[in-house]
């Protein structure tokens, strides 16, 4: 195989590969012919002029996992056929300046993990062939303006994960080629103007992880092809109106972990590719009309972990295909009785964690798919007769931890939790809070004894007992003409009391997702 | 260890309906989009169907659309396909496969199950 | 929708040949594209993602590159178990569509 070296292994088709902590200098003879070279995990520390110099038809050279910390400047004179070059997962601090001059065939160039401080403004002069630059993973503090001007075929490059605050709004001026921009991890605190202007061929911009507290209304103007944008985990506390009207074939888009206290109606373009939207933990306090009316094809949307106290009657309007809504974890007390009116495909609602103090009878009025609902851990007292009427699918309901108000009010809710008992889980069951006699009995399965038809618990109830949701029949109505001829508040008899079992999956996001 | 297994697969006659099943074990479920894929016999890989982590978002090839249903249950780490008005044509070897993304470029099936058999004919 | 096509739609190469399969995607996909393996009777199995990125536990000698329209898998020394067919498929978009596959045999 034309000399292969004894540390490594070679290939009729002209594969060399050298690999092991046994390695500590540059092997050599190489193959003349070798093609594909790959150094990886070695204790190289340093690479010298002359070791490439024999192997001109070296097409891609990978040294990885090394422990190279000096490159010399003519280390790769000769290389004139090299298409790929990966130094990744080094020691690198920095690149002699004409490093690169004799390789400018080259198309991709992974420099990623490394822990270069400062790229040099001619460094990659003569790469007008690169389609990938990686640098993510180092030190760079600033990326000097002209660095990229002639990397007119880029298309992809990633500078995240290194320490820069700023970038100057013409660092990708000549870009036009671009498809995809990394920038996640990085410590930008705001972005002029125009820096993305030129990118009209942009799909991915990453700019999550950063500090960036304002966004330019103008900012993404230029970048109709744009399909994610990730801008989540910043403190980015306004979005400007408009800021997001020419991103027609957006399908991915993160504001999560952000400082947002409100939405500006219409906010969020024409976005028919836009399937989630993700907007937990911010700060939001309340959303006005038509916040979200231009995301028609829209399936989920994740408010929880803000602050809401307030959402107007016609937030939710165009949401025609909203099956998932997340509000858990919100200060709301009150919802009118027409929010969710327009959310005709309602699979999944979670209003759990609030201070909801009642409902409106028509809040799920038009909903009539819903088949999950929480409303754990709010202040309800009771709910309106006929609230879950209509819902023939509805396989899943929490209504743990309110102060449900046990008196004669509460009768049709009772009966109507007794016959459908299994869609309460098998967690956590609703308990009466008062009056003080029957505090902490469960009010699914208390012994309701008043004058009239007495309304029997089952006798001894075990949670394992009972059908499952999935298999349970459709739900039996609270009949909203039932007549409560039963009275008094304290004639009851407590038959059994379940202990809570405290596993409570409260239904959302992942945790991941979710914070 | 990580892993995914298909159930349901049949013999039905066109007309007909089917449910799959896929369980999953190994790693936390409901942190994952997931998907369906299908492969006819000697032809090549058709992506059919995925359903967001939480169950909320779905999304389908229009050759199944109207026809097919995708769901999940968090609880029971299993995935669901309802079939449908099947057809001749959707005779094949049907996959459940994490889909696996982030923000950082990660896109991928990168847990796949073994595979089974639906046979649609009369 | 976008449609992936990959060339050639079969190869016959020995051990230790270099290999490269194209896929060509009929708009800009960015870098969006995975490439996987599939062998007889088996599901298919990740080897890149992110048009590039080597998924953990498969061998160096897999690389892929491209962005766009044109992405290029590249096995550099083939290995007796790497006779199999191989897809690419693309993220960008609904649907996910895959390629048609390209199939290595043993010449």
């Known amino acids: 195989y034309y000399g292969c070296p004894s540390e490594c292994t070679c290939s009729r088709a002209s594969q060399v590969e050298c690999t092991g902590a046994q390695i500590v200098a540059m092997p050599s003879p190489l193959p003349w012919n070798a093609m594909s070279l790959q150094i990886l995990n070695t204790h190289i520390t340093e690479l010298p002029e002359d070791k490439f110099l024999n192997i001109s038809a070296l097409i891609a050279l990978k040294m990885e996992k090394n422990e190279l910390a000096n490159i010399m400047p003519g280390a790769f004179r000769n290389l004139g056929s090299l298409r790929h070059l990966s130094l990744a997962n080094n020691k690198l601090k920095n690149l002699p300046v004409r490093l690169f001059q004799d390789v400018n065939n080259l198309e991709t160039l992974l420099l990623s993990n490394n822990q270069l401080v400062q790229i040099q403004p001619a460094q990659f002069s003569q790469f007008s062939n690169l389609k990938e630059l990686q640098l993510y993973g180092n030190n760079l503090e600033y990326i000097p303006e002209g660095v990229f001007d002639h990397l007119v075929g880029l298309t992809k490059l990633n500078l995240g994960n290194n320490g820069f605050t700023h970038l100057s709004p013409r660092v990708f001026q000549h870009l036009g080629n671009l498809q995809v921009l990394r920038l996640y991890e990085n410590r930008l605190s705001d972005i002029p103007m125009g820096t993305f202007d030129a990118l009209g061929n942009l799909q991915e911009l990453a700019l999550q992880e950063n500090q960036i507290g304002t966004l330019s209304p103008g900012l993404f103007h230029n970048n109709r092809n744009l399909q994610r944008l990730y801008l989540s985990n910043n403190h980015i506390s306004h979005l400007p109106p408009g800021i997001f009207m020419q991103l027609p074939h957006l399908n991915k888009l993160t504001l999560f972990g952000n400082s947002l206290k409100e939405l500006s109606p219409g906010v969020f373009g024409p976005m028919p590719n836009l399937r989630e939207l993700w907007l937990y933990n911010n700060h939001i306090t309340s959303l006005p009309d038509n916040a979200f009316s231009h995301l028609n094809q829209l399936q989920v949307l994740i408010l929880s972990h803000n602050q809401l106290s307030y959402i107007s009657p016609g937030a939710f309007n165009g949401l025609t295909n909203l099956r998932e809504l997340s509000l858990h974890t919100n200060a709301l007390q009150d919802l009118d009785g027409n929010v969710f009116r327009s959310l005709a495909n309602l699979r999944n609602v979670s209003l759990q964690n609030n201070r909801l103090r009642q409902l409106p009878g028509s809040i799920f009025a038009n909903v009539n798919g819903l088949m999950t609902i929480q409303l754990q851990n709010n202040n309800l007292e009771n709910l309106p007769l006929g609230i879950f009427d209509h819902l023939g699918n509805l396989c899943e309901l929490r209504l743990y931890d309110n102060p449900w108000r046990c008196d004669s009010n509460i009768l049709p809710l009772h009966d109507w939790l007794i016959l459908n008992r299994a869609r309460l889980g098998t967690d956590t069951l609703p308990v009466c809070s008062s009056p003080a006699s029957v505090r902490g009995q469960s009010l699914v399965i208390i012994n309701v004894n008043f004058p009239g038809p007495s309304v029997q618990g089952p006798e001894t109830p075990e949670v394992s007992s009972y059908p499952d949701t999935s298999s349970y029949p459709d739900s039996t109505s609270i009949s909203s003409t039932t007549e409560i001829t039963r009275s008094t508040d304290d004639d009851y008899t407590d038959l059994n009391t379940i202990e809570p079992i405290d596993d409570r999956n409260t239904w959302g996001m992942t945790d991941a997702q979710s914070g | 260890q990580v892993q995914l297994v298909e159930s349901g697969g049949d013999l039905v006659t066109p007309g007909g309906s089917l449910r799959l099943s896929c369980a999953a074990s190994g790693f936390t479920f409901s942190d994952y989009y997931m998907t369906w894929i299908r492969q006819a016999p000697g032809k090549g890989l058709e992506w059919i169907s995925d359903i967001g982590s939480s169950g909320g978002s779905v999304d389908y090839a229009d050759s199944v659309k109207g026809r097919f249903t995708i769901s999940r249950d968090n609880a029971k780490n299993s995935l669901y396909l309802q079939m449908s008005s099947l057809r001749a044509e959707d005779t094949a070897v049907y996959y459940c496969a994490r889909y696996n993304w982030n923000d950082r470029g990660y896109d991928g099936f990168d847990i796949w199950g073994q595979g089974t058999m639906v046979t649609v004919s009369s | 929708e976008i449609v992936l096509t990959q060339s050639p739609s079969s190869l016959s190469a020995s051990v230790g040949d270099r290999v490269t399969i194209k896929c060509r995607a009929s708009?800009?996909?960015?870098?969006?594209l995975a490439w996987y393996q599939q062998k007889p009777g088996k599901a298919p199995k990740l080897l890149i993602y992110?048009?590039?990125s080597l998924e953990s536990g498969v061998p160096s000698g897999f690389s892929g590159s491209g962005s766009g329209t044109d992405f290029t898998l590249t096995i550099s020394s083939l290995q007796p178990e790497d006779f199999a067919t191989y897809y690419c498929q693309q993220f960008n978009s609904y649907p996910h569509t895959f390629g048609p596959g390209t199939k290595v045999d043993i010449k």
């Open positions: 708009q800009g996909i960015s870098s969006a």
């Open positions: 992110d048009a590039s």
